[in-house]
Amino acid sequence: IWELKKDVYVVELDWYPDAPGEMVVLTCDTPEEDGITWTLDQSSEVLGSGKTLTIQVKEFGDAGQYTCHKGGEVLSHSLLLLHKKEDGIWSTDILKDQKEPKNKTFLRCEAKNYSGRFTCWWLTTISTDLTFSVKSSRGSSDPQGVTCGAATLSAERVRGDNKEYEYSVECQEDSACPAAEESLPIEVMVDAVHKLKYENYTSSFFIRDIIKPDPPKNLQLKPLKNSRQVEVSWEYPDTWSTPHSYFSLTFCVQVQGKSKREKKDRVFTDKTSATVICRKNASISVRAQDRYYSSSWSEWASVPCS
């Protein structure tokens, strides 16, 4: 058993049918010695008397808020949560496996640049009685500070007969050095509590591996005289790291016909302009990627040919 926060304790339960459970001793936080009784949640049933209460925790029915009283007065509370292990594996029931980029991916994180700021998000089908707490650091043995805000509900979507809820959190490395080579990964730890169930989830990454630039901005077309060609131009996104001479992007320019089956013409360039043939009813799209490190491409920025 360990303390999650004041008066909230997590009991680690290795569960299997007929498991004996965990013996837990609760101590009433009071100088009183006599006339103390214990109850669980809203029940008035007395579970025991004395300054300590020994319970056998076998299942969620044994978790909850234990209260010690004396003469009708509440002395202290202890909320017991369960962290359940089955077949040697800690439960991961609260969050949904996003399966991207691999199975057992519960947390996904992205950064728009090298400033040390990043966003993580996760999915759940649970709508109520749910709380999250996020901590982060760079490295784990001698951790350097990363400050995370509160997790917030960022999206709701319907998937078949299921409603899915997306939560996200923004974090900022306290002493980020954008140009430095990373040697220690960022660690992100999410505590999730649903009703009386506690679970924890972790992710470990280098900022360079989670970079996804914003799409190029100010995408414009300039027709070339007496030609079907156009000059496409764009700019670096405002959120990208500066100076651009050091934090450089490479770009992919795509001409896509109205039909998805039509052949796509693609041009790759390090410049912020390109000359392409603009077909009728086609659109031109441009996306960006770090020039020197193959992290994610940005989403596309698009304009119609007409």
Epitope: F60, T125, D161, K197
Partner: nanobody, 123 residues
Framework: EVQLVESGGGVVQAGESLRLSCAAS????????MGWFRQAPGTEREFVAT????????YYADSVKGRFTISRDNAENTVYLQMSSLKPEDTAVYYC????????????????WGQGTQVTVSS
């Protein structure tokens, strides 16, 4: 929301068997741990059995262990309670419940409930 409808109750002789079914509709059935409870007249609702969302783990009240079997079919959105060697003291209204905490024998840990099906065991 999850809607639960129990069926399969009836009157049987002591020692006989009965199979209860609980059909779920609404939100995705496979997200939920499922349980069976029962209530005899003048008594509190009593835990019978529960099964986790995968169908890989089960948990039973001592009073039914070895006689009752809970199972589920996530493709059919149905949970079953196979009851054998029935005794007169098994007479009760049987309720199906859906929740998110497994295992739990406490009724308030379940979020959705059916209307119940009557089982009567005569001696």
């Amino acid at each position: 929301e999850v809607q639960l409808v129990e069926s399969g109750g009836g009157v049987v002789q002591a020692g006989e068997s009965l199979r209860l079914s609980c059909a779920a509709s609404g939100r995705s059935f496979s997200n939920f741990e499922m349980g069976w409870f029962r209530q005899a007249p003048g008594t509190e609702r009593e835990f019978v059995a529960t099964i986790n969302w995968r169908g890989s783990s089960t948990y039973y009240a001592d009073s039914v262990k070895g006689r009752f079997t809970i199972s589920r079919d996530n493709a059919e959105n149905t949970v079953y309670l196979q009851m054998s060697s029935l005794k007169p003291e098994d007479t009760a209204v049987y309720y199906c419940a859906a929740g998110r905490l497994f295992p739990s024998s406490r009724s308030r840990d379940y979020d959705y409930w059916g209307q119940g099906t009557q089982v009567t065991v005569s001696s």
